[in-house]
């Protein structure tokens, strides 16, 4: 299936040009999306091109500026947040990135009623997290690992926690491992729907081993970065959840929420918190051996002033074939009765589907079914449930939005997006206003992305929010590569692949092949999305064929494929890449003497193992920031898929699956190893150990480090990285510069 045909015709060939590396590095062909910042059923805020904050009312068609760019500029604000009572706006400046989601910033409160900044009892700086209550204008914020509460922006703060300590106790914000591997947020506090209560997590990292690495900076001596980071099998953070009454916090104090007995009996994680009403909260817990999850619904008992989590409101989710959930355990979406909920988990056939839970999980009513997967529940209203899936036309790499009418019986299903812009749009997400009165659809491809606004009742398109016209015009004279998404059937395994072909691709010719791999558990690389990136350039300008293959362990095609890698990381992911390459060679247009593989992070691990597989298929390859041994990576992630590195569990496979164990096999390939020295995620240690093993085996290889760069290798390092990798590949494929 050709998803993005090149617009090359002989008549216009002269005016067309190939992509250049400079195009990619400059972001010349980047696209925009439009996500409304909903503030009611029919109103949203948006930051205009000239940086004014504008309020749009869909029903009246009116818009007005609530905050001028002058005010924004006066404090160098890069972000904002309107209080729900619309009296105040917080302005965020001095953004300073920490880890993937976390950052600190300076916050100013602007009073919209008098057009002045709030003076007196100003917020301290830098703040780690700040948010408005869902109703009114209470503020909760985290400063120096402690949580504070303001009843009004001009009021003095009430300090909720006092034990916060850098790298030791984290209140209201996650530690490194919870941020990266469990919550995927910068915050760990949650307001109840009307702002009566504030729930928060406390993470105690006192006993966690610390990863230390040098940050070279510009000083005479490098400084040492210390992060409590539990690697596989190490001591984990100890988590506790508290809830405080924000109306009179000084009186009752924080109430600790009890952990379900079956969870508390051994090491465990807290995985998420969902408020149902002001007096009902749902907590999700997970055993350290991550195949058992418990969802616990707790009620506030006014007479006791306590949170009661009865055993009858504990719902157990267990996997017997792998780990609980997909990448994370799914979160519940509660219905209007405030006790039943919708949740995605595996059905009896091993496909993730929406289930309705009224009393027990055993009696769950399956809402969706089929040999495809429900991926996200966006919104449940009184009569509709909106979700995304990859059902349409049986392409796992697509996302369409569906509506199920839950108000009628039997429920009817409608695909909202399948036929809207069928060629252009096959991969959607959505953003809903209150009560799903309106929604925005954001289409990511395969054509040029487009964002549109829709009526939540009729699904009618109201207007285009962003259609990337400038990008469309800029691409008119570019020879884009062709892309196709197809599948291979091998030994009862379906391997979906995306192939990116040079613009003048000719099946009778031979092309160098580059495999781009990620391959991590529950990931998906073969997606019907638009991208003009480095591999687009390699196909367009350098005439390479690039292929991405989703093998065993990848997501959204059922548990058989997903859980195939359970406790065996580094085996089937690699096998499936190799199998796919052999199939590509059989297609007849691949030069089998010029095949390379590259990947980043988990992909760096897979590419390294593929190069060291001893097949002789690969001439060269690149590993960027690879994992080299699962003993070096984070406990939460690693143990989910690998169990524990202990003799009585899975130590043997931990040892067998290292890159270092295969050092000898790198002798007959050209290997480029790349890593940032300040990688907080996949530590430089991983590449240092590969390099040591290769040196000890007297195997030649190439390497590049990026001083003081993290896992993302951003900024000028990005340019250097892609330039360096381009040279390496061109040399490997004997392409002239």
């Amino acid at each position: 299936i050709v998803l993005r045909p090149s617009r090359v015709h002989n008549s216009e060939e002269n005016t067309m040009r190939a992509l250049t590396l400079k195009d990619i590095l400059n972001g010349t062909f980047s696209y925009k999306t439009f996500f409304p910042n909903w503030i009611s059923g029919q109103e949203y805020l948006h930051q205009s091109a000239d940086n004014n904050i504008v309020l749009y009312n869909i029903e009246t068609g009116q818009s007005y500026t609530i905050l001028s760019n002058r005010t924004m500029k006066s404090v160098n604000a890069s972000n904002y947040g309107l209080s729900p009572d619309r009296q105040f706006v917080y302005l965020e400046s001095d953004y300073s990135k920490l880890w993937r989601y976390s950052y600190t910033a300076t916050y100013y409160i602007y009073d919209l009623s008098n057009g002045e900044f709030v003076r007196g009892n100003e917020l301290p700086r830098p703040i780690q997290y700040l948010c408005w209550s869902p109703v009114g204008s209470k503020l909760a914020y985290v400063y120096q690992n402690n949580i504070y509460l303001k009843q009004r922006p001009g009021d003095p703060p009430f300090q909720i926690t006092f034990n916060g300590r850098e790298n030791k106790i984290f209140n209201g914000i996650p530690d490194w491992v919870y941020e990266e591997e469990m919550l995927a947020t910068k915050y760990a506090l949650w307001w109840s729907p009307n702002g009566k209560f504030l729930a928060y997590a406390e993470f105690n990292d006192t006993d966690i081993p610390v990863i230390a690495y040098s940050y070279y900076g510009d000083e005479q001596y490098p400084r040492t970065i210390n992060i409590p980071y539990p690697k596989a099998g190490a001591k984990n953070p100890v988590v506790r959840i508290f809830i405080i009454d924000t109306t009179y916090p000084a009186y009752v104090g924080p109430q600790e929420v009890p952990v379900p007995a079956m969870i508390a009996s051994s090491d465990y994680y807290f995985s998420w918190l969902t408020w149902v009403t002001d007096e009902r909260v749902c907590l999700q817990w997970l055993k350290r051996v991550q195949n058992v999850s418990v969802l616990s619904i707790c009620d506030f008992r006014e007479d006791w002033q306590t949170w009661d989590c009865p055993k009858t409101q504990e719902h157990i989710e267990e996997s017997r074939t792998g780990w609980a959930g997909g990448f994370f355990v799914s979160t519940p979406v509660f219905s209007y009765d405030a006790i039943s909920y919708y949740k995605i988990f595996s059905d009896k056939d091993g496909y993730k589907h929406i289930h309705y839970i009224k009393d027990t999980v055993e009696n769950a009513i399956q809402i969706t079914s089929g040999k495809w997967e429900a991926i996200n529940i966006f919104r449940v209203t009184q009569d509709s449930l909106f979700y995304s899936s990859n059902e349409f036309e049986e392409y796992p790499g697509r996302r369409n939005i569906y509506r199920i009418s839950i108000g009628s019986y039997p429920p009817s299903k409608k695909c909202v997006t399948c036929h809207l812009r069928k060629e252009r749009c096959q991969y959607y997400t959505a953003s809903f206003s209150d009560y799903a009165k309106y929604y925005a659809l954001v289409c990511y491809g395969p054509g040029i992305p487009i964002s549109t606004l829709h009526d939540g009742r009729t699904d009618q398109e109201i207007k285009i929010l962003e259609e990337n016209k400038e990008l469309e015009n800029a691409l008119k004279n570019i020879q884009l590569p062709k892309e196709e998404i197809k599948k291979l059937e091998v030994d009862e395994i379906t391997l979906w692949y995306k192939m990116i072909l040079p613009p003048q691709f000719d099946r009778s010719k031979k092309y160098p092949l580059l495999i781009q791999v990620y391959g991590g558990p529950c990931s998906q690389s073969v997606r019907s999305v638009f991208a003009v990136n480095w591999i687009s350039y390699l196909a367009s300008k350098e005439g390479m064929v690039i292929a991405l293959v989703d093998g065993r362990g990848t997501a959204f095609q059922g548990d058989k494929l997903l859980y195939a890698v359970y406790r065996k990381l580094g085996v089937y992911e690699v096998e499936d890449q190799i199998t796919a390459v052999r199939k590509f060679i059989e297609m007849g247009f691949i030069d089998e003497k010029r095949i390379a593989i590259w990947g980043w992070s988990y992909g760096g691990y897979v590419s390294s193992l593929a190069l060291a597989s001893g097949t002789g298929l690969f001439k060269c390859g690149i590993a960027v920031a690879p994992v080299s041994s699962w003993e070096y990576y984070a406990s939460v992630y690693t143990e989910r898929f690998m169990g524990l590195p202990t003799k009585d569990d899975n130590l043997e496979h931990y040892k067998n699956s290292t890159v270092m164990a295969r050092a000898e096999y790198f002798r007959n390939v050209d290997y480029l190893l790349i890593h940032g020295t300040a990688d907080d995620n996949v530590h430089f240690q991983n590449s240092a150990q590969i390099a040591k093993a290769l040196v000890n085996a007297q195997v030649d290889f190439q390497a590049m480090w990026y001083s003081d760069q993290n896992h993302g290798l951003s900024g000028l390092s990005t340019n250097h990285l892609y330039t360096h990798m381009t040279h390496f590949l061109k040399q490997c494929f004997s392409l002239s510069d």
Epitope: P156, P157, A250, Y251, G253, Q255, W304
Partner: antibody, heavy 117, light 108 residues
Framework: EVQLLESGGGLVQPGGSLRLSCAAS????????MSWVRQAPGKGLEWVSA????????YYADSVKGRFTISRDNSKNTLYLQMNSLRAEDTAVYYC??????????WGQGTLVTVSS | EIVLTQSPGTLSLSPGERATLSCRAS???????LAWYQQKPGQAPRLLIN???RRATGIPDRFSGSGSGTDFTLTISRLEPEDFAVYYC?????????FGQGTKVEIK
């Protein structure tokens, strides 16, 4: 009816130790934060320490930090204050009170601690 | 720590009169975190005005609390004989919670 009953006070030499108890009844003890407040003879009130319902968080006034330990046994509906390294300035009537940092709506009758050689 | 200064130190009034007791904080507190107590000789303190200017359970409506920021007032609209006692204000916004030094309301 809510009742708080302190015990364990008495005469102790400087450097000595005492353990105060506060037996609670008439409410769900484990749900509520509790505090100790003291009053030196003829003087005003001074907050000493607080503990949340589960016992998981405790706080102390600087004047007693490192010497006093607040704890509770929810199965016995009892609050404790372990006082070590006592000084003359710790002489006071010690009250247990229901509450966290404020709004102490129920108080015990108090127990007198005298630190003297 | 927040210092609470109560004034006057002693207030001499007759039954039936209005009593106005003042409590000034060294930094902003707000009424959400200020409480008032009554203490009679040989007895434990009794909560009068809970945080948020709410009268505690069983407290007659002649007692009322007001104020914001740093200045707070306890008003007893008509003094009854049983109201002659020492009154303390207390803040709970910042650790450590602190009490004022007290105002003694005595019979004139």
């Amino acid at each position: 009816e809510v009742q708080l009953l302190e015990s364990g006070g008495g005469l102790v030499q400087p450097g000595g130790s005492l353990r105060l108890s506060c037996a609670a009844s008439g409410f769900t003890f484990s749900s509520y934060a509790m505090s100790w407040v003291r009053q030196a003879p003829g003087k005003g009130l001074e907050w000493v320490s607080a503990i949340i319902g589960s016992g998981g968080i405790t706080y102390y006034a600087d004047s007693v930090k490192g010497r006093f330990t607040i704890s509770r046994d929810n199965s016995k509906n009892t609050l404790y204050l372990q006082m070590n390294s006592l000084r003359a300035e710790d002489t006071a009537v010690y009250y247990c009170a229901k509450g966290w940092f404020g709004g102490f709506n129920y108080w015990g009758q108090g127990t007198l601690v005298t630190v003297s050689s | 720590e927040i210092v609470l200064t109560q004034s006057p130190g002693t207030l001499s009034l007759s039954p039936g009169e209005r009593a106005t007791l003042s409590c000034r904080a060294s930094q902003s507190v707000t009424s959400s975190y200020l409480a008032w107590y009554q203490q009679k000789p040989g007895q434990a303190p009794r909560l009068l005005i809970n945080v948020g200017s709410r009268r505690a359970t069983g407290i007659p409506d002649r007692f009322s609390g007001s104020g914001s920021g740093t200045d707070f007032t306890l008003t007893i609209s008509r003094l009854e004989p049983e109201d002659f006692a020492v009154y303390y204000c207390q803040q709970g916004i910042m650790l450590p919670p602190t009490f004022g030094q007290g105002t003694k309301v005595e019979i004139k």
